[in-house]
């Protein structure tokens, strides 16, 4: 029959500066039942405020809605752990929205392949941003990231699109069954969880080129140019 | 009220087993536990472990690991201390004590075993 | 372990007296720190618990107070029924652990 452990709050994640939950993990178990609460204030401000809600974040978690969030200010908040033997307190975090963003997957990839009749194949895929982020506003920069690799493949091939939401790639193995997938990450903040993968059946009939690929680039405003495997790696992330 | 009633004094041999039970009333016993602390004849309180009636948790001391049990029964409410290879040197008071609202707020009467060949 | 060292082992006093008992850990114990009484053939009582709040029915003449380490227990005005061993006891970590107890005599 112990107090509780130190928890210790350890994860804040905002989807779209508008709303944001905080997460915690409970210190050693005391062997009896433990209750938790969260309180905050506004750096700055001395009033301390409990968590506005439990239960939307799941279980250790305090959510934060719309009318709970300020932008430009940092949050002070710990959590209290107390069975009848005593409290815990978690040490104090500091959380300011901006730089804990990380938006929903982005949403829609498709994913095709064409095959113009004067130049290579190759797969384009396009994607649209998570709804929950307004881009119109200026607020957020989104950068993005795809990765494939063919079915039965370990190793997962990744290439970096800057603010795009298209992309095109040269280069993959004919006959083969790809998926593909990408993530988004605010200028400042996490990247998201990748999409749902969506597969590609290559055309056994696709064109092989090692030495070229050819992709989008962003300053090209989605025209396309042949690049090499060298300057290739300056896109490239594995 | 809360009350914590542990059973008659008990006479053993060296090597036998004991087995001293703690029987709880006046609360919700499956959201504590049981924890027994012995006291030596002119000595102070020694705290032996305890049996979590919430969860079955057990946190012993180390120098009874070996052989003692503890446990909780919460159909009976009724805390168990089972101490087997006894030596002269667990001829003790034993009590019970237990969380109702605050640390260690109700014990038992007390249990003297007393061994002896 | 974490150590508990009371001090006096056994003090005197009048009725009326005010008398402090302390008790030092040999680490910090986050203020988990009980006391007891108790008197010749009979359980300990709780008196204080997290170093300085008292358990329901006991009187105000006691007081608990300290932190991290250092501890003491304060009787404002001794009563004969207050000739008895205290103990301290810390429960921040497993085993738990008693100090060796302060016996108040009456002078």
């Known amino acids: 029959q112990l107090p509780p452990g130190k928890p210790e709050i350890f994860k804040c994640r905002s989807p779209n500066k508008e709303t944001f939950t905080c997460w915690w993990r409970p210190g050693t178990d005391g062997g009896l039942p433990t209750n938790y609460s969260l309180t905050y204030h506004r750096e700055g401000e001395t009033l301390m405020h409990e968590c506005p809600d439990y239960i939307t974040g799941g279980p250790n978690s305090c959510h934060f809605g719309k009318q709970y969030t300020s932008m430009w200010r940092t949050y002070v908040m710990m959590v209290n752990a107390t069975n009848q033997m005593g409290s815990s307190f978690s040490d104090e975090l500091y959380v300011d929205v901006t730089y804990i963003v990380q938006p929903d997957p982005p949403l829609e990839l498709t994913v095709e392949v064409k095959q113009p009749e004067d130049r290579k194949p190759y797969l384009w895929m396009k994607w649209s941003p998570p709804t929950l982020i307004d881009l119109k506003t200026g607020w957020f920069t989104l950068l993005y990231e795809i990765r494939l690799k063919p079915e039965k493949a370990a190793e997962w091939e990744t290439h970096f699109a800057g603010q795009q939401t298209e992309f095109k790639i040269l280069s993959l193995h004919p006959g083969q069954k790809y998926l593909v997938q990408v993530r988004c990450k605010p200028d400042h903040g996490y990247w998201s969880a990748w999409s749902p993968a969506t597969f590609i059946q290559i055309p056994s009939d696709f064109i092989m080129n090692d030495e070229q690929k050819l992709i989008s680039e962003e300053d090209l405003g989605g025209e396309q140019k042949l690049i090499s495997e060298e300057d290739l790696h300056h896109h490239h992330h594995h | 009220q809360v009350q914590l009633v542990q059973s008659g004094a008990e006479v053993k041999k060296p090597g036998a087993s004991v087995k001293v039970s703690c029987k709880a009333s006046g609360y919700t016993f499956g959201t504590s536990g049981i924890t027994w602390v012995r006291q030596a004849p002119g000595q102070g309180l020694e705290w032996m472990g305890w049996?979590?009636?919430?969860?079955?948790?057990?946190d012993y001391a180390q120098k009874f690991q070996d052989r003692v049990t503890m446990t909780t029964d919460t159909s009976t409410t009724t805390g168990y201390m089972e101490m087997r290879s006894l030596t002269s040197d667990d001829t003790a008071v034993y009590y019970c004590t237990t969380v109702v609202r605050r640390p260690f707020d109700f014990w038992g009467q007390g249990t003297l075993v007393t061994v002896s060949s | 372990d974490i150590q508990m060292t009371q001090s006096p082992s056994s003090l005197s006093a009048s009725v009326g007296d005010r008398v402090t008992i302390t008790c030092r850990a040999s680490q910090d114990i986050n203020n988990f720190l009980a006391w007891f009484q108790q008197k010749p053939g009979k359980a300990p009582k709780s008196l204080i618990y997290a170093a300085s709040s008292l358990q329901s029915g006991v009187p105000s003449k006691f007081s608990g107070g300290g932190s991290g380490t250092d501890f003491a227990l304060t009787i404002s005005s001794l009563q004969p029924e207050d000739f008895a061993t205290y103990y301290c006891q810390q429960y921040s970590s497993y085993p738990i652990t008693f100090g060796q107890g302060t016996r108040l005599e009456i002078k």
């Open positions: 049996s979590s009636a919430y969860n079955g948790k057990t």
